[in-house]
Interface confidence: low
């Protein structure tokens, strides 16, 4: 058993049929010595008396808010949550496996630049009695500070018969060094509590591996005289790290016909302009990627040829 | 060419070669960035390789003030990785093809380190640990780890030379 926060405790249980459970001793936070009784949740049934209460925690029915009283007065509370371990693996019932980039990916994180700011998000089908708490650090043996905000509900989607809820959090490394080569990964820890079930989820990454620039901005076409060619130009996204002579991007320019089956023409360039042939009813799209490290491409910025 | 305490390197040549290094490092193992090879002891093991750290003067301001600190750090790293790529980890079984990107990467690391330090000038270099993994899975694991770490190192080096070529070239 360990303390999650004041008066909230997590009991770790091996979860299998006829498991013996864990013996837990609760102590009433009071100078009083006698006349103390214990109850669980809203029940008035007295579970025991005395300053301490010993219970065998085996299932969710044994978890909840234990309260010690004297006379009609509440002296203190202890909320017991359960953390299930099945076949040696901690349960992951609360969050949905996003399966990207690999199985057992519950947390996904992205950064728009090298400033040390990043966003993580996760999915669940649970709509009520759900709380999240997020902590982060750079490295784990001698952790350096990363400050995370509160997790908020950022999107709701309907998936078949189910509703899916997306939560996200923004974090910022306290002393980020954008130009340095990271040697210690960022660790993100999410505590999730649904009713009386506790679970924790972690993700470990380097900012460089989660970089995804915003799409290029100000995408414009300039027709070239007496030609089907056009000059496409664009600019670095505002959110990208500066100076651009140091934090450089590379770009992919694509000409795509109306039909998905039509052959796509692609040009790769380090410049912020390119000359392409504009076909009728086609569109021109440009996306960006870090020039020197193969992290994710940005989403496409597009304009129609006409 | 960068000489200890001396003149500027051939920024444009260094830029071209460092950008080539980036391409080669990713073609040597394109999956490296997406492989989950971070074990328990990874924090310790990453410290075996030289990293370009915050105080090494490789940021735009540091390069403007005095690029020598940063160039020396990059040189150390290039020599270190060049030795690693020439070691038993990469030369032993499972053997790589003679024209593999690793062979080209090895040659390019050497080329860039020589651009930075001509014969006769010696910056201190970091000791390379003596490595003799004996099993294929060990070698594969170490190759992945080294290449992934090299990808990060050459990305920073390439940024330095790109910025130098754009702003510090005579």
């Amino acid at each position: 058993i360990w303390e999650l926060k004041k008066d909230v405790y997590v009991v770790e249980l091996d979860w299998y049929p006829d498991a013996p459970g864990e013996m837990v001793v609760l102590t009433c936070d009071t100078p009083e010595e006698d006349g103390i009784t214990w109850t669980l949740d809203q029940s008035s049934e007295v579970l025991g008396s005395g300053k301490t209460l010993t219970i065998q925690v085996k299932e969710f029915g044994d978890a909840g808010q234990y309260t010690c009283h004297k006379g009609g007065e509440v002296l203190s509370h202890s909320l017991l949550l359960l953390h299930k371990k099945e076949d040696g693996i901690w349960s992951t019932d609360i969050l949905k496996d996003q399966k990207e980039p690999k199985n057992k990916t519950f947390l996904r994180c992205e950064a728009k630049n090298y400033s040390g700011r990043f966003t993580c998000w996760w999915l669940t089908t649970i709509s009520t009695d759900l709380t999240f708490s997020v902590k982060s650090s750079r490295g784990s043996s001698d952790p350096q500070g990363v400050t995370c905000g509160a997790a908020t509900l950022s999107a709701e989607r309907v998936r078949g018969d189910n509703k899916e809820y997306e939560y996200s959090v923004e974090c910022q490394e306290d002393s980020a060094c954008p130009a340095a080569e990271e040697s210690l990964p960022i660790e993100v820890m999410v505590d999730a509590v649904h009713k009386l079930k506790y679970e924790n989820y972690t993700s470990s990454f380097f900012i460089r591996d989660i970089i995804k620039p915003d799409p290029p901005k100000n995408l414009q076409l300039k027709p070239l005289k007496n030609s089907r060619q056009v000059e496409v130009s664009w600019e670095y996204p505002d959110t990208w790290s500066t100076p651009h002579s140091y934090f450089s991007l590379t770009f992919c320019v694509q000409v795509q016909g109306k039909s998905k089956r039509e052959k796509k023409d692609r040009v790769f360039t380090d410049k912020t302009s390119a000359t392409v042939i504009c076909r009728k009813n086609a569109s021109i799209s440009v996306r960006a990627q870090d020039r020197y490290y193969s992290s994710s491409w940005s989403e496409w910025a597009s304009v129609p040829c006409s | 060419r960068a000489v200890p305490g001396g003149s500027s390197p051939a920024w444009t040549q260094c830029q071209q070669l460092s950008q080539k290094l980036c391409t080669l490092a990713w073609s040597a193992h394109p999956l490296v960035g997406h492989m989950d090879l971070r074990e328990e002891g990874d924090e310790e093991t990453t410290n075996d390789v030289p990293h370009i750290q915050c105080g090494d003067g490789c940021d735009p301001q540091g390069l403007r003030d005095n690029s020598q600190f940063c160039l020396q750090r990059i040189h150390q790293g290039l020599i270190f990785y060049e030795k690693l790529l020439g070691s038993d980890i990469f030369t032993g079984e499972p053997s790589l093809l003679p024209d593999s990107p690793v062979a080209q990467l090895h040659a390019s690391l050497l080329g860039l380190s020589q651009l930075l330090q001509p014969e006769g000038h010696h910056w201190e270099t970091q000791q390379i640990p003596s490595l003799s993994p004996s099993q294929p899975w060990q070698r594969l694991l170490l190759r992945f780890k080294i290449l992934r770490s090299l990808q990060a190192f050459v990305a920073v080096a390439a940024r330095v030379f790109a910025h130098g070529a754009a702003t510090l070239s005579p």
Epitope: - | G41, E44, P133, L140
Partner: antibody, heavy 117, light 108 residues
């Protein structure tokens, strides 16, 4: 001539953990990998994972990921395999073996781990 | 992971006969890093062949290994009484090394 000597038999309760040791003598320990292989009664050999003591790199079979921890202490030339959340199916003989370029050439005598309530 | 399938599961032969054991891999074994082990009841396995065809130190010449890619064979040219045991193949050419399920060579 390298020899690997393992710790003695263990009887464990379901849900508990077991830690088996494997001490090398008569040769260099650090440069080789030590692999752990188990064999359930009447069954075949199953590789669990291995470690290169010199680097501390451990590599685990997918099946045991999260439940097994392999460590090595170079100062005593000893490798350890800890398996947690034991269940009856983990009853087996656990072997350590020196894992060299030519397969597993030296094996420990085996440690029987019995999981029973 | 590479799956190794050994056949037959049991081989019933008499002393002096030739034994041919097969090991098939679900995908090509990198560098032909395939080993064969012999195991007798109550004993640890013993390395016989490594690298598909090289005999380990002290292994009699009647044991030979062959094959490459996905098909490998262990041959015992003339069975001696002490050769009746279980034989396992083992690929160690990938990050996750695997064993076959074993072939039992028993006295007919």
């Amino acid at each position: 001539q390298v020899q690997l000597v393992q710790s003695g038999a263990e009887v464990k309760k379901p849900g508990s953990s077991v830690k088996v040791s494997c001490k090398a003598s008569g040769g260099t320990f650090s440069n080789y990998a030590i692999s752990w292989v188990r064999q359930a009664p009447g069954q075949g050999l199953e590789w669990m994972g291995g470690i290169i003591p010199m680097f501390g790199y451990a590599n685990y079979a997918q099946k045991f990921q999260g439940r097994v921890t392999i460590t090595a202490d170079e100062s005593t030339s000893t490798a350890y395999m800890e398996l947690s959340s034991l269940r009856s199916e983990d009853t087996a003989v656990y072997y350590c073996a020196r894992d060299i370029y030519a397969g597993m050439d030296v094996w420990g005598q085996g440690t029987l781990v019995t999981v029973s309530s | 992971d590479i799956v190794l399938t050994q056949s037959p599961a049991t081989l019933s032969l008499s002393p002096g006969e030739r034994a041919t054991l097969s090991c098939r891999a679900s995908q090509s074994v990198l560098g032909n890093y395939l080993a064969w082990y012999q195991q007798k009841p109550g004993q640890a396995p013993r390395l016989l062949i490594y690298g598909a065809s090289s005999r380990a130190t002290g292994v009699p010449a009647r044991f030979s290994g062959s094959g490459s890619g996905t098909d490998f064979t262990l041959t015992i040219s003339s069975l001696e009484p002490e050769d009746f045991a279980v034989y396992y193949c083992h690929q160690y050419g990938s990050i996750s090394t695997t064993f076959g399920q074993g072939t039992k060579v028993e006295i007919k």
